[in-house]
């Protein structure tokens, strides 16, 4: 058993049928010695008396808010949550496996640049009685500061019969140098509590590996005289790290017909312009990627050919 | 501690091409190592990230773009002094700091070259003959060093008398390649910045 926060405790249980559970001793936070009784949640049934209460915690019916009283007055509370260990592996019931970029990916994180700011998000099908708390650091043995905001509900979607809820959090490394070569990964830890179930999820990454630039901006077409060709031009996104000659991007330009089955023409360039043939009803799209370290491509910025 | 913006004339920077080749070569070598050593801990998540140049060179700091010198988090590092003559410096206006930067890059390359050659000698003794260093990568390191053309003491190749532990050698190879790839990215960024300046 360990303390999650004041008066909230997590009991770690080896979770299998007929498991013996864990013996827990609760102590009433009071100078009083006599006439103390204990109850669980809203029930008025007295579970025991005395300054301490010993309970055998086996299942969720044994968890909840234990309260000690004296003469009708509440003295203190202890909330017990359960953390299930199933065959040596901590349970992951609360969050959905996003399966990207690999199986058992519960937290996904992205950064728009090298400033040390990043966003993480996760999915769940649970809509109520759910709280999240996020902590982060650079490294784990001698952790350096990363400040995270509060997790917020950022999207709701319908997936088949189920509703899916997306939560996200923004974090910022306290003293980040965009040019630094990372040797210690960022660690992100999310505590999730659903009713009386506690779970924790972690992710470890280097900012360089989660970079995903914003799409190029100001995408424009300039027809070339007496030709079906157009000059496409664009600019670096505002959110990208500067100077651009140091933090350079590379670009992919794509000409896509109306039908998804039509052949796509693709050009790769380090410049911020390219000459392509514009077909009728086609659209031109451009996306960006760090020129020197191949992390994710940005989303496409698009303009119609017409 | 930073690079001035107004230095060599555009197109007068022969090191850019070499640094691009270097990044390509080390990336290919790392990919090959990850595939060949699939039963060894060779991914970025599994290895310890060690920098063999730590406390010996200060490339990131010496080559910091002018625009980032206002960022205090970028300025908390060591001072290192280097020899200052090099053929990549195509202009007499080149500042002392730029020479320091390129000299630091040269020292990095020299250190990695020695490590890789020592390691290759060990890998050649492996009866499994599982992996060797790409000669192209070693050649590209050499070319960039020649383009930088700094006078520097030659570092003798480390020789070891004890029987090599091939498992440890292969893991060390992965660690070195990951670190060298990160340094090659920095070198490429620096060369690109200098070329644009």
């Amino acid at each position: 058993i360990w303390e999650l926060k004041k008066d909230v405790y997590v009991v770690e249980l080896d979770w299998y049928p007929d498991a013996p559970g864990e013996m827990v001793v609760l102590t009433c936070d009071t100078p009083e010695e006599d006439g103390i009784t204990w109850t669980l949640d809203q029930s008025s049934e007295v579970l025991g008396s005395g300054k301490t209460l010993t309970i055998q915690v086996k299942e969720f019916g044994d968890a909840g808010q234990y309260t000690c009283h004296k003469g009708g007055e509440v003295l203190s509370h202890s909330l017990l949550l359960l953390h299930k260990k199933e065959d040596g592996i901590w349970s992951t019931d609360i969050l959905k496996d996003q399966k990207e970029p690999k199986n058992k990916t519960f937290l996904r994180c992205e950064a728009k640049n090298y400033s040390g700011r990043f966003t993480c998000w996760w999915l769940t099908t649970i809509s109520t009685d759910l709280t999240f708390s996020v902590k982060s650091s650079r490294g784990s043995s001698d952790p350096q500061g990363v400040t995270c905001g509060a997790a917020t509900l950022s999207a709701e979607r319908v997936r088949g019969d189920n509703k899916e809820y997306e939560y996200s959090v923004e974090c910022q490394e306290d003293s980040a140098c965009p040019a630094a070569e990372e040797s210690l990964p960022i660690e992100v830890m999310v505590d999730a509590v659903h009713k009386l179930k506690y779970e924790n999820y972690t992710s470890s990454f280097f900012i360089r590996d989660i970079i995903k630039p914003d799409p190029p901006k100001n995408l424009q077409l300039k027809p070339l005289k007496n030709s079906r060709q157009v000059e496409v031009s664009w600019e670096y996104p505002d959110t990208w790290s500067t100077p651009h000659s140091y933090f350079s991007l590379t670009f992919c330009v794509q000409v896509q017909g109306k039908s998804k089955r039509e052949k796509k023409d693709r050009v790769f360039t380090d410049k911020t312009s390219a000459t392509v043939i514009c077909r009728k009803n086609a659209s031109i799209s451009v996306r960006a990627q760090d020129r020197y370290y191949s992390s994710s491509w940005s989303e496409w910025a698009s303009v119609p050919c017409s | 501690r930073n690079l001035p913006v107004a230095t060599p004339d555009p197109g007068m920077f022969p090191c850019l091409h070499h640094s691009q080749n270097l990044l390509r070569a080390v990336s290919n070598m790392l990919q090959k190592a990850r595939q060949t050593l699939e039963f060894y801990p060779c991914t970025s998540e599994e290895i310890d990230h060690e920098d063999i140049t730590k406390d010996k060179t200060s490339t990131v700091e010496a080559c910091l773009p002018l625009e980032l010198t206002k960022n205090e988090s970028c300025l908390n590092s060591r001072e290192t002094s280097f020899i200052t003559n090099g053929s990549c410096l195509a202009s007499r206006k080149t500042s002392f700091m730029m020479a320091l930067c390129l000299s630091s890059i040269y020292e990095d390359l020299k250190m990695y070259q020695v490590e890789f050659k020592t390691m290759n000698a060990k890998l050649l003794m492996d009866p499994k003959r599982q992996i060797f260093l790409d000669q192209n990568m070693l050649a590209v390191i050499d070319e960039l060093m020649q383009a930088l053309n700094f006078n520097s003491e030659t570092v003798p190749q480390k020789s070891s008398l004890e029987e090599p532990d091939f498992y440890k050698t292969k893991i060390k190879l992965c660690i070195l390649l990951h670190a060298f790839r990160i340094r090659a990215v920095t070198i490429d960024r620096v060369m690109s910045y200098l070329n644009a300046s």
């Epitope: 080896d14 979770w15 299998y16 049928p17 007929d18 498991a19 299942e59 969720f60 260990k85 199933e86 065959d87 040596g88 592996i89 019931d93 690999k102 199986n103 058992k104 099908t125 | 039963f39 801990p41 599994e46």
Partner: antibody, heavy 115, light 112 residues
Framework: QVQLVQSGGGVVQPGRSLRLSCAAS????????MHWVRQAPGKGLEWVAF????????YYADSVKGRFTISRDNSKNTLYLQMKSLRAEDTAVYYC????????WGQGTMVTVSS | SYVLTQPPSVSGTPGQRVTISCSGG????????VKWYQQLPGTAPKLLIY???QRPSGVPDRFSGSKSGTSASLAITGVQAEDEADYYC????????????FGTGTKVTVLG
């Protein structure tokens, strides 16, 4: 005490269907994940499928994906394995088992796929 | 497709020490706990070892388990005639959990 009693096995022709049941008692069935494991005659153990305690997530071995469906009825304390498009290579003893560090197994039920 | 490899058979005379190896990789045994089962002919598997080296109550202390890196082993010190059975190791793969990964199985024969 924990008990898992299996039923539903038998002889079936290739291409046909069969449903296995596993009735649980002696524990809070709705709190635990459950597996199906099979063993072909003279061969080793092969995992078939898993279902979460609340039925929200199901996982299958590649060899049965798209043909077998694991389900549970927590009100009846029963686990099921619906097997469709059966093949000769599905011939095996099928076991249900609880998920956890200490597990409990059903007695096994024989499924023979033969024309 | 078995990812955990065991020797097909091992044998020993009563009282001898018999060991069975179970070889895996970084993503399974290297990252997860190992269990060992004993299966007597015509019966369901019986749990012998969980959590690499833990014995459930009722399992004789001549059975012991251990794990090192990407391999695990089961030792029977002072093997007895009633130990003649098939033995299976089991773990998980970190990418496919909760799918159970079983070893290929080892037939233990008690001679004499």
């Amino acid at each position: 005490q924990v008990q898992l009693v299996q039923s539903g096995g038998g002889v079936v022709q290739p291409g046909r269907s069969l449903r296995l049941s596993c009735a649980a008692s002696g524990f809070t069935f709705s709190s635990y994940g459950m597996h199906w494991v099979r063993q072909a005659p003279g061969k080793g153990l092969e995992w078939v499928a898993f279902i979460r305690y609340d039925g929200s997530n199901k996982y299958y071995a590649d060899s049965v994906k798209g043909r077998f469906t694991i389900s549970r009825d927590n009100s009846k304390n029963t686990l099921y394995l619906q097997m469709k498009s059966l093949r000769a290579e599905d011939t095996a003893v099928y076991y249900c088992k609880t998920h956890g560090s200490h597990d409990n197994w059903g007695q096994g039920t024989m499924v023979t796929v033969s024309s | 497709s078995y990812v955990l490899t065991q020797p097909p058979s091992v044998s020993g005379t009563p009282g001898q020490r018999v060991t069975i190896s179970c070889s895996g990789g970084r993503s399974n045994i290297g990252s997860n706990d190992v269990k060992w089962y004993q299966q007597l002919p015509g019966t369901a598997p019986k749990l012998l070892i969980y959590g690499n080296d833990q014995r459930p109550s009722g399992v004789p202390d001549r059975f012991s388990g251990s794990k090192s890196g990407t391999s695990a082993s089961l030792a029977i010190t002072g093997v007895q005639a009633e130990d003649e059975a098939d033995y299976y190791c089991q773990s998980y793969d970190r990418g496919t959990h909760p799918a159970l990964l079983f070893g290929t199985g080892t037939k233990v024969t008690v001679l004499g």
